[in-house]
Interface confidence: low
């Protein structure tokens, strides 16, 4: 029978689509050779036993966004060819135990966004061909042992957003082909040792947005093929030594939004493919030597929004390929002159929103490729002479929202800023904080005109001047021997600011730093 129900559309008689709130019962009769049936956005509340008897060729059945609350046990009888079944976005609370017994060739089963409160242990027992099972967004308080034991071909399992608080360590024991396991948005507080041991082919494990407080040391040791591990927005306060030791293929690890207080050296043990490490929004107070030394391919390290007050000089040892380092919004007051020495490929560093009072003259000595430096909103009163001399690629420097002390010691910085004005961007220029007579005046000044002896910068520099670079043709070089005749008075005269202060962009981060 090639007819098409009046409330449906039939494409080439093998694809049937029935949509609309006016549909309150299963349309019939359905074309006997239908291969794809979609019933979407209807008010169907019940699925009787006999509606699919005549469409045994059906391969895909999609009943999504309906009001479906009740399915009879034999509803899918005679659908032996069915490979894809979606019942997502309905109001199902329970499924008959033998509901799926006749659809044993299913490859995908989507049950997301229903109100399922339990799964029977035998619910999926005949699904040896099932590759994807989606149970996201239900009310499953626990997963019975054995429920997945027969799903030996499963590659993707989504159990997110259900609200279960614990997992049996044996629940995944037969899922050796699983590649993606998503357990995010639950209330897991503890994951038993051995839970993931059978998942040797796992590539993605999503555990974010739970209440996990501790991780067993060997939790991931059998997951050597893991590429993406999401642990963000949990309550993790401690990373056991060796927790990440057996993850050679990991290329993404998120730990932001936890309660980490410290990182022991070597905790991020050899992960040669890890390119990004997200650690923002934790409670980390200090970084020890060699905290990241095994991550020689890391390119992005985000440590913003922590409570860092101390960084050991060797904290970043080994990060020879790091491009982006985000340290903004911490409690840093001082930095060791060698802290960035091993970061030869660093391009962007964000240090804004800290309490930095001064910077060592050698802080950027080995980081010749720096392109952006964010130093706004700190406690800087001056900078060492020559601190930016060698940074030929520097194109963005943010210095505003610091209490710059505009006495005679600021003159070398002032002159360098005039010559390198283009690097300061257009958002906000640095302004003087003291002495009182120049408070609020721009530190980039066209004309400072008063006589006096030449002055030196506040520290003995390793490099002796603030030159421009050829990237900025309007600039001219200034050497350390340039005689600057200035008064030694605290107050300037003839202060002509270039332009009024712009609205302030307090954050000024790159995309990767905006964590």
């Amino acid at each position: 029978y090639y007819g098409c129900p009046s409330e449906c559309t039939c494409s080439r008689a093998s694809q049937v689509e029935c949509t609309g709130a006016q549909i309150v019962a299963m349309p019939s009769p359905l074309p006997w050779n239908a291969m794809s049936l979609q019933i979407l956005n209807t008010h169907i509340t019940e699925l009787p036993e006999d509606k699919f008897l005549n469409i045994s060729a059906l391969i895909a059945l999609k009943m999504e966004k309906n009001e479906l609350a009740n399915i009879m046990p034999g509803a899918f009888r005679n659908l032996g060819s069915l490979r894809h079944l979606s019942l997502a976005n309905n109001k199902l609370k329970n499924l008959p135990v033998r509901l799926f017994q006749d659809v044993n060739n299913l490859e995908t089963l989507l049950l997301s966004n229903n109100q399922l409160v339990q799964i029977q242990p035998a619910q999926f027992s005949q699904f040896s061909n099932l590759k994807e099972l989606q149970l996201y967004g239900n009310n499953l308080e626990y997963i019975p042992e054995g429920v997945f034991d027969h799903l030996v071909g499963l590659t993707k399992l989504n159990l997110g957003n259900n609200g279960f608080t614990h997992l049996s360590p044996r629940v995944f024991q037969h899922l050796g082909n699983l590649q993606v396991l998503r357990l995010y948005e639950n209330r897991l507080s503890d994951i038993p040792m051995g839970t993931f041991d059978a998942l040797g082919n796992l590539q993605e494990l999503a555990l974010q947005e739970n209440q996990i407080g501790t991780l067993s040391p060997g939790l991931f040791h059998n997951n050597r093929n893991l590429q993406r591990l999401y642990l963000s927005n949990n309550h993790i306060s401690h990373l056991p030594p060796g927790i990440f030791m057996q993850l050679p293929h990991l290329n993404k690890l998120t730990l932001f939004g936890n309660s980490l207080k410290e990182l022991s050296p070597g905790v991020f043990g050899p992960m040669p493919n890890l390119r990004e490490l997200w650690l923002y929004n934790n409670h980390i107070t200090s970084l020890p030597d060699n905290a990241f030394s095994h991550l020689n391919q890391l390119q992005v390290l985000i440590l913003s929004h922590n409570q860092l007050s101390y960084i050991s000089p060797g904290a970043f040892n080994g990060l020879t390929n790091l491009r982006e380092l985000s340290l903004h919004t911490n409690a840093l007051q001082d930095l060791d002159g060698n802290v960035f020495r091993s970061l030869a490929n660093l391009r962007n560093v964000s240090l804004q929103n800290n309490r930095l009072r001064q910077l060592p003259g050698s802080i950027f000595a080995n980081v010749n490729g720096l392109m952006t430096i964010q130093l706004q909103n700190n406690n800087l009163e001056n900078l060492p002479l020559g601190i930016f001399d060698h940074l030929g690629n520097l194109c963005e420097l943010r210095l505003y929202d610091n209490p710059w002390r505009c006495d005679s010691n600021i003159l070398p910085l002032h002159d360098w800023l005039i010559l390198n004005r283009a690097r300061l961007g257009t958002d906000t220029l640095p302004v003087c904080s003291s002495p009182a007579s120049v408070r609020g005046q721009s530190l980039v000044i066209i004309n400072v005109n008063f006589p006096g002896p030449s002055v030196q910068g506040p520290e003995t520099p390793e490099v002796s001047s603030y030159p421009d670079t050829s990237s900025y043709p309007d600039s001219t070089s200034i050497s350390s021997t340039t005689e600057i005749t200035r008064s030694t008075d605290d107050d300037y005269t003839d202060l002509n600011t270039i332009e009024p202060i712009d609205d302030r962009n307090t954050w000024g981060m790159t995309d990767a730093q905006s964590g």
Partner: antibody, heavy 123, light 113 residues
Framework: EVQLVESGGGLVQPGGSLRLSCAAS????????MAWVRQAPGKGLEWVAS????????YYADSVKGRFTISRDDSKSTLYLQMNSLRAEDTAVYYC????????????????WGQGTLVTVSS | DIQMTQSPSSLSASVGDRVTITCKSS????????????LAWYQQKPGKSPKLLIY???TRQSGVPDRFSGSGSGTDFTLTISSLQPEDFATYYC?????????FGQGTKVEIK
Amino acid sequence: EVQLVESGGGLVQPGGSLRLSCAASGFTFRDYYMAWVRQAPGKGLEWVASIGFDESRTYYADSVKGRFTISRDDSKSTLYLQMNSLRAEDTAVYYCTRHGVSYYSGDNWFAYWGQGTLVTVSS
Amino acid sequence: DIQMTQSPSSLSASVGDRVTITCKSSQGLLYSGDQKNYLAWYQQKPGKSPKLLIYWASTRQSGVPDRFSGSGSGTDFTLTISSLQPEDFATYYCQQYYDPPYTFGQGTKVEIK
């Protein structure tokens, strides 16, 4: 400036083989997933295959699985597509593309495209 | 596999017109792990390679004029050209990169009225 230059296209008989190459420059090749996308004459775009940071991370469209092999040589900044058992329906312009985000999985967009190389499968 | 369906398949418009192209995916492209929609838009002119316009459903690629904007979430997405310019006459494709196989819409050809 990112540049992707494909070569190796041409006329081949059904059942024959062809190897496409893509020479990349202007970026750090090893940092990116790479892909091939094709376009049959007068038709839309079809993703063919992607490759990650090593040979173990390869993904294929069902239509070419088992017949095509994507590979890369990071030392030469070159992407390859070995095409075997070619069929008439493989006739298309083949584009070499770079995924958009470095140090990231293949699950992101195609930011840069080569000019394409035409493969014609006909007897 | 995720199917992508664009509409209309072609449209005629004049310079200065506001043009809207829609794209529907067969499953949601919003990943709750990062709250991003895994969808991109491309422009292709005859005889040329495709060019990326939009990624993450609404983020404009560097250098793309701001008359191009993307919106939508989940399964329904839109590309809008606020004021059509002569150089905008081309074919536009949406693409999902949520999961391989990465699939494209069939294309929408924007022609001169």
